[in-house]
Interface confidence: low
């Protein structure tokens, strides 16, 4: 199989004019640009405070970026007749701080959703499943892009941000068909334990530029379709045997580990041995030690067991102050 682009990016856009008349089904909403040939509507940087009600039925690609939407209520895109062709929805940078349950209901063809760069103080557990049933109807989503959706500290709810996002990803097992998930730049300290088990179709997972310290409690075992795992720019110190074995067991995966503060002591021995023989890690020759000080900037692939020692732990009576 081969890939190609099927939509025309050079199709003319029709800027709409505000009208007192009720909208026709394929009329362009005020403050938007529309191209029926490209099946695209762009309502970009217009300070919109709500989703236009009069979107044309032909819309396949909808850009609502750079607005001031604040809240996405249930049924925000529900129309009669429904927007049956809407496949790609970009809401990035629209000052959303609340996405409620069922916000994306009645979009039967929605394959790609981008909520990046919105400070989501509240993401409903049912934002993507649309229902509080233990098993919901499958979502059509294939690509979910949630980069930099962490709110400022003063806007966070009491519960953990990681837990809030995880609850939305696993609710009703609705996202079992998801192929791509981007969660970069969200200050994640950990990945909730059961999230990946509910996303068995993932091919591409981006967790870069977070604050992940450890993957000890994360299981990649069932992600048999995973092709790209991005863990760059986190706070990882070492990968332990269980994680190494799981990654090695994934048939198609490529793992990206650059710019983590690797601690090159005796606990690193297994990872170094694995790195020397694995083909899984991309750019493995670029990985360097950050700690201890004497090992800083040493290349992991060039280390041997004699380099990887741990200071003995002295009994309290022998410790010096």
């Amino acid at each position: 199989t081969s890939s190609a682009s099927s939509s025309s990016s050079s199709a003319p856009f029709l800027a709409s004019a505000a009208s007192a008349q009720p909208p026709l089904p394929d009329q362009c909403p005020a403050l938007c640009e529309c191209s029926e040939a490209a099946r695209t509507v762009k309502c970009v940087n217009r300070n919109l405070t709500e989703v236009p009600t009069d979107l044309p039925l032909y819309v396949r690609n909808l850009f609502l970026t750079g607005n001031q939407l604040a809240v996405l209520p249930a049924g925000a895109f529900a129309r009669r007749p429904p927007l049956a062709e809407l496949a790609a929805l970009n809401l990035s940078g629209s000052r959303l701080d609340e996405v409620r349950g069922g916000a994306f209901e009645h979009l039967p063809s929605l394959r790609q959703l981008d909520l990046s760069h919105n400070p989501l103080a509240y993401l409903s557990p049912f934002a993507f499943s649309g229902s509080n049933a233990s098993i919901s109807a499958p979502s059509p989503l294939v690509e979910l892009i949630l980069n930099h959706i962490v709110p400022p500290d003063d806007k966070r709810q009491n519960r953990s941000f990681e837990g809030m996002v995880a609850a939305a990803l696993v609710a009703g097992r609705a996202l079992q068909g998801l192929h791509l998930l981007e969660l970069a730049s969200n200050h994640f300290l950990y990945l909730p334990r059961d999230v990946l088990a509910q996303l068995p179709s993932l091919r591409y997972l981006d967790l870069s530029n977070n604050s992940l310290v450890s993957l000890t409690y994360v299981s990649f075992r069932n992600l048999t379709h995973l092709e790209s795992l991005h863990l760059e720019d986190n706070a990882l110190k070492v990968l332990h045997n269980g994680t190494l074995a799981e990654l090695q067991g994934l048939p198609h995966v490529r793992v990206f580990l650059d710019n983590n503060p690797w601690v090159c002591d005796c606990h690193m021995a297994d990872m170094v041995t694995w790195l020397k023989q694995t083909g899984v890690v991309q750019g493995k020759d670029r990985l360097t030690c950050a700690f201890p000080e004497k090992m800083r900037n040493r290349v992991l692939l060039e280390l041997n067991s004699a380099d990887l020692d741990c200071d003995p732990i002295l009994p309290p009576s022998l410790q010096t102050s």
Epitope: A84, S109, V142, E143
Partner: nanobody, 120 residues
């Protein structure tokens, strides 16, 4: 591995009919909109018809409206194109297309095509 295999093409006289099929595998067929495209000799790719996930909404090129019907059977993972009242200008290679996502993964898949020749 995603695979799309078209069949049903061939030589037909003007005014005749053909039914093209596209057997899909390697992805959850029922979750994706599907399309038929065609490419006539020396011409560009033209969208012929598309159908949404459950088959509730279809669209057609003006040149085939009223003559062609797109349908799908999600239970059989198969897309169809019923072509009636065929004309010489319908001669082309017809391609099945699954738009699985335009973003990072090159997930816009095509079959190998099936040739339809309309000639007396």
């Amino acid at each position: 591995e995603v695979q799309l295999v078209e069949s049903g093409g061939g030589l037909v006289q003007p005014g005749g009919s053909l039914r093209l099929s596209c057997a899909a595998s390697g992805f959850t067929f029922s979750s994706y909109a599907m399309s038929w495209y065609r490419q006539a000799p020396g011409k560009g790719l033209e969208l012929v018809a598309s159908i949404t996930t459950a088959g509730g909404s279809t669209r057609y090129a003006d040149s085939v409206k009223g003559r062609f019907t797109i349908s799908r059977d999600n239970a059989k993972n198969t897309l169809y194109l019923q072509m009636n009242s065929l004309r010489a200008e319908d001669t082309a290679v017809y391609y099945c297309n699954a738009e699985l996502g335009p973003r990072r993964l090159g997930m816009d898949y095509w079959g190998q095509g099936t040739l339809v020749t309309v000639s007396s």
